[in-house]
């Protein structure tokens, strides 16, 4: 879903049961620690020397919804995610490095603690390099492992 096409779209939804109060996880993993802003996430990544994983998504996007369920239910993903600084965003930041090939959702971008965007860690779709679908969960797991191999910083 290209979010530049439909910004501010409303979600036609009615929950079938009362939900818990919304948290920063937004359903991507309630047991994980999520940061609130990009600035906070960058600071935490640098100071903790943990890579940052940023998930761009939209509530009203079916593919965001589908990926979210698989991500949240996959035990390996959730376990590995503990080693990251985590941020999920339902809006775009002003940092163009977070949309190297467009502002589509869902997309997942990794940032090294050296504050280098890992544009080299891509999914399988040539037209949307940072997009993942539920069938790509094994690839996402591999890419998370790649991101954990930190870039060497010059002394």
């Amino acid at each position: 879903k290209d979010i530049t096409v439909k910004s501010g779209a409303k979600k036609d939804t009615k929950d079938s049961a009362p939900k818990l109060p919304q948290t920063l996880s937004r359903g991507w993993g309630d047991q994980l620690i999520w940061t609130q802003t990009y600035e906070e996430a960058l600071y935490k990544s640098k100071t903790s020397n943990k890579p940052l994983m940023i998930i761009h998504h939209l509530d009203e996007c079916p593919h965001s919804q589908a990926l979210k369920k698989v991500f949240a239910e996959n035990k390996e993903i959730q376990k590995l995610a503990e080693q990251f600084v985590l941020l999920n965003l339902v809006y775009e930041t002003t940092d163009k490095h977070l949309s190297p090939d467009g502002q589509y959702v869902p997309r997942i971008i990794f940032v090294d603690p050296s504050l280098t965007v890992r544009a080299d860690i891509t999914g399988r779709y040539s037209n949307r390099l940072y997009a993942y679908e539920p069938s790509d969960i094994a690839l996402l797991l591999d890419n998370m492992k790649k991101a954990l191999k930190l870039l060497k910083t010059e002394l």
Epitope: K1, D2, V5, K6, K11, D12, T13, K14, D15, S16, A17, E60, C61, P62, H63, Q65, A66, K69, V70, E73, N127, R128, E133, P134, S135, I137
Partner: antibody, heavy 120, light 107 residues
């Protein structure tokens, strides 16, 4: 193998409600989206909404939002579609259709359909 | 809502003919398009998803192509059992929307 078995035909009066069931088997019920689609006599297909049985999350076509409720019962691996304030134009065959086996949104398997007739 | 325009609305072809049905979306839907076959009195059957991926068990004479706004379903060699109505569906955005259908008959 995957099976979606829907409840039998219903005849309802205008203003009434109808609840159609779709009993599933042959896959992990909680991890595939379930869609509902309808088809009026001699007409095309129309998407009503979907539900994720794992946690009950739903999304509805705005056309039906105020009248439709999708629910799931994990104990019986059954999803339900309830449509209220029925009118004659709701006369249609209602289908449940499971999403992809891996949690993808595409519609993979279909139930046999349930004819709902609304007539005074 | 995204509009899906399917053409032709009906066609008549001979057994063995190559048949092409097109679907045009009112906006870019990436590759999030499926094709279904429906025979009278039956539920639809899914043939293709993600524009070009063939569902297990569907004969290889069926194929899908396209991305963005323009999509095609091709039956490479029409068989008598292919007589049906064919529908496309976009699932890029809520609400999912179907094309109006193409009725395929044998000459």
């Amino acid at each position: 193998q995957v099976q979606l078995v829907q409840s039998g035909a219903e005849v309802k009066k205008p203003g009434a409600s109808v609840k159609v069931s779709c009993k599933t088997s042959g896959y992990v019920f909680s991890r595939s989206w379930m869609n509902w689609v309808r088809q009026a006599p001699g007409q095309g297909l129309e998407w009503i909404g979907w539900i994720y049985p794992g946690d009950g999350d739903t999304n509805y076509n705005g056309k039906f939002k105020d009248r439709v409720t999708l629910t799931a019962d994990k104990s019986t691996s059954t999803v339900y579609m309830e449509l209220s304030s029925l009118r004659s134009e709701d006369t249609a065959v209602y289908f449940c259709a499971r999403g992809g086996y891996d949690g993808s949104p595409w519609l993979s398997y279909w139930g046999q359909g349930t004819l709902v007739t609304v007539s005074s | 809502d995204i509009q899906m325009t399917q053409s032709p609305s009906s066609l008549s072809a001979s057994v063995g003919d190559r048949v092409t049905i097109t679907c045009k979306a009112s906006q870019d839907i990436n590759s999030y398009l499926s094709w279904f076959q429906q025979k009278p009195g039956k539920a639809p059957k899914t043939l293709i998803y993600r524009a070009n991926r063939l569902v297990d068990g569907v004969p290889s004479r069926f194929s899908g192509s396209g991305s963005g706004q323009d999509f095609t379903l091709t039956i490479s060699s029409l068989q008598p059992e292919d007589i049906a109505t064919y529908y496309c569906l976009q699932y890029d955005e809520f609400p999912f929307t179907f094309g109006g259908g193409t009725k395929v008959e044998i000459k």
